[in-house]
Interface confidence: medium
């Protein structure tokens, strides 16, 4: 069958999220990939959504994050949006009202978008052919 | 071609007022999400605060909070930031920038000078 259009969406978005460095994508976030055994794709889908959520959420305004030059605020700026993109996107494939975010373990942003990047391409491959 | 100009700024004493202006250009003002950005002597950016397109809601950082007041006027294509109870701390440059779309647009800056 067809991917969903917001498939589509979101490995665009993670394309240009993966593309470059920010003074904050080393800034580290709950790694909900450490133990996802036992977790739906829905579910997956809804934490990762929600660590996205907190992250942007801490960091929109953080004066390390925007930086000294008017290009690291622009590239900041431009990060939380991708972020806010990719939140959406995602809740809209979770389907989920909300979902608990409990693990102890901690990957940078860049490795938790990379490992979300693999799953999303793993599921396009799938339902594309 | 997009331009924001500010103005407004100066030298003022400490406690004193400034009312800060920035007109906007070569795109759809009432689409855009604007901020307030300073930067101090020798030091990096610091956000200031943020207004949404249709001037609802508004954003301020901790430091400026009570003190200044952000708004603007779409009919004119007018960007404000009224700063009030001024501190020496509060001495940077001034910028005016869109930071609600996919893209982002700088003005000049206006110097905000707090001394006795």
């Known amino acids: 069958h067809k991917c969903d259009i917001t498939l589509q969406e979101i490995i665009k978005t993670l394309n240009s999220l993966t593309e470059q460095k920010t003074l904050c994508t080393e800034l580290t976030v709950t790694d909900i990939f450490a133990a996802s055994k036992n977790t739906t794709e829905k579910e997956t889908f809804c934490r990762a959504a929600t660590v996205l959520r907190q992250f942007y959420s801490h960091h929109e305004k953080d004066t390390r994050c925007l930086g000294a030059t008017a290009q690291q605020f622009h590239r900041h700026k431009q990060l939380i949006r991708f972020l806010k993109r990719l939140d959406r996107n995602l809740w809209g494939l979770a389907g989920l009202n909300s979902c608990p975010v409990k693990e102890a373990n901690q990957s940078t942003l860049e490795n938790f978008l990379e490992r979300l990047k693999t799953i999303m391409r793993e599921k396009y491959s799938k339902c594309s052919s | 071609e997009v331009q924001l100009l500010e103005s407004g700024g100066g030298l003022v004493q400490p406690g004193g007022s400034l009312r800060l202006s920035c007109a906007a250009s070569g795109f759809t003002f009432d689409d855009e999400m604007m901020s307030w950005v300073r930067q101090a002597p020798g030091k990096g950016l610091e956000w200031v605060s943020e207004?949404?397109?249709?001037?609802?809601?508004?954003y301020y950082a901790d430091s400026v909070k009570g003190r200044f007041t952000i708004s603007r006027d779409n009919s004119k294509n007018t960007l404000y930031l009224q700063m009030n109870s001024l501190r020496a701390e509060d001495t940077a440059v001034y910028y005016c920038?869109?930071?609600?779309?996919?893209?982002?647009?700088w003005g000049q800056g206006t110097l905000v000078t707090v001394s006795s």
């Open positions: 920038a869109t930071t609600g779309s996919d893209f982002d647009y």
């Open positions: 207004i949404t397109a249709g001037g609802v809601i508004t």
